[in-house]
């Protein structure tokens, strides 16, 4: 799903108040839910029948430094019998979301939000057929 | 998939350098990459054999301040006849996600990142069945 | 192991009601959703009706809807299902099952016999 524009106003103090010195802001340390856990199904991108294989990048400058992307095995679904139905299309489900980008030079530290595209799994859609004349 | 802990050693500066005053550090306006757009395919919510709802949750003080969270429609999977096939399981897809939490007192503004899990859409999978003894 | 026990089945006259429990127990891992089959003596496996555990939303099979009742009590780890107005046609072994998404466990079964 989609993450609007800032529009800048969101990161902006109210107007009666001075202005954000130097185009930045105050970021407290420390996560809030920071031990919150994703409680999936035990290995759902080998049983689903739009099954994916995942991919994990690494940036020691970005957090989280791991970022998971995962990719459909199959253009097309697999069926009862355990074979690949093309009549089906194997389609990723893709999530915008937050990384934060940290940036230094000496000891001169600073942050900046990063939009970032993960495909997260896929699932299996009907597709619509469209004869061309 | 999984964001790890802080650890907090991502947001502090090298050893040899002075510590960061306050537990905060310099958050930088404005958001790389912010034009990026997911580009999934159209209405896959519907046309899904594993289908799903939205649900909008909307927070002023959080950035994006629009999450929105997938529900899977059935429990089980729609087979090509249309009929709800109940030896197969729609299943949550599930992403943890950064947002940013904006806190005020007057002209006083600070940020904190926050983790948030949003079930993103799902998948069709057939399980594995087990009889207890 | 999980361990599911069914109880509450019986011989009850049409018309008549029956309340079925199911125990769970063991490593109930992620619950996606949990409920009840039923198997009518020389036909196969039906599904009469399931809970869904991250929001509560309750499912029924379309020849049960409006009769049956599915409810849990978390801190009993108790299971139910309410028979209203049974029919002939209920007579059945219900079966109890959690399932994780990725794997379904059955119980071994109560027998419900209806008779006109």
């Known amino acids: 799903r989609k993450i609007p524009k800032v529009g800048h106003t969101f990161f902006q103090k109210p107007e009666s108040c001075p202005p954000v010195p130097g185009g930045s802001m105050k970021l407290d340390i420390g996560i809030i839910n920071e031990n919150q856990r994703v409680s999936m199904s035990r290995n759902i991108e080998s049983r689903s029948t739009s099954p994916w294989n995942y991919t994990v990048t690494w940036d020691p400058n970005r957090y989280p430094s791991e970022v998971v992307q995962a990719q459909c095995r199959n253009l097309g679904c697999i069926n009862a019998q355990g074979k690949e139905d093309i009549s089906m299309n194997s389609v990723p489900i893709q999530q915008e979301t937050l990384v934060v980008r940290r940036k230094h030079q000496g000891c001169s530290v600073s942050f900046q939000l990063e939009k970032v595209l993960v495909t997260v799994g896929c699932t299996c859609v009907t597709p619509v057929i469209h004869h061309v004349q | 998939r999984k964001i790890p802990k802080v650890g907090h050693t991502f947001f502090q500066k090298p050893e040899s350098c002075p510590p960061v005053p306050g537990g905060s550090m310099k958050l930088d306006i404005g958001i790389i990459n912010e034009n990026q757009r997911v580009s999934m395919s159209r209405n896959i919510e519907s046309r899904s054999t594993s289908p799903w709802n939205y649900t909008v949750t909307w927070d002023p003080n959080r950035y994006p301040s629009e999450v929105v969270q997938a529900q899977c429609r059935n429990l089980g999977c729609i087979n090509a006849q249309g009929k709800e096939d109940i030896s197969m399981n729609s299943v949550p897809i599930q992403q943890e996600t950064l947002v940013v939490r904006r806190k005020h007192q007057g002209c006083s503004v600070s940020f904190q990142l926050e983790k948030v899990l949003v079930t993103v859409g799902c998948t069709c999978v057939t399980p594995v069945i087990h009889h207890v003894q | 192991q999980v361990q599911l026990v069914e109880s509450g089945g019986g011989f009850v006259q049409a018309g008549g009601s029956l309340k079925l429990s199911c125990s769970v127990s063991?490593?109930?891992?992620?619950?996606?959703?949990m409920g009840w089959f039923r198997q009518p003596p020389g036909k196969g496996r039906e599904f009469v009706a399931g809970?869904?555990?991250?929001?509560?939303?309750?499912f029924y099979g379309d020849s049960v809807r409006g009769r049956f009742t599915i409810s849990g009590d978390n801190a009993k780890h108790t299971l139910y299902l309410q028979m209203n107005s049974l029919k002939p046609d209920d007579t059945a072994v219900y079966y109890c099952?959690?399932?994780?998404?990725?794997?379904?466990?059955y119980g071994q079964g109560t027998l419900v016999t209806v008779s006109s």
């Open positions: 063991g490593n109930t891992f992620i619950t996606n959703h």
């Open positions: 099952y959690i399932d994780s998404g990725s794997d379904r466990y």
């Open positions: 809970i869904r555990w991250s929001d509560g939303s309750t």
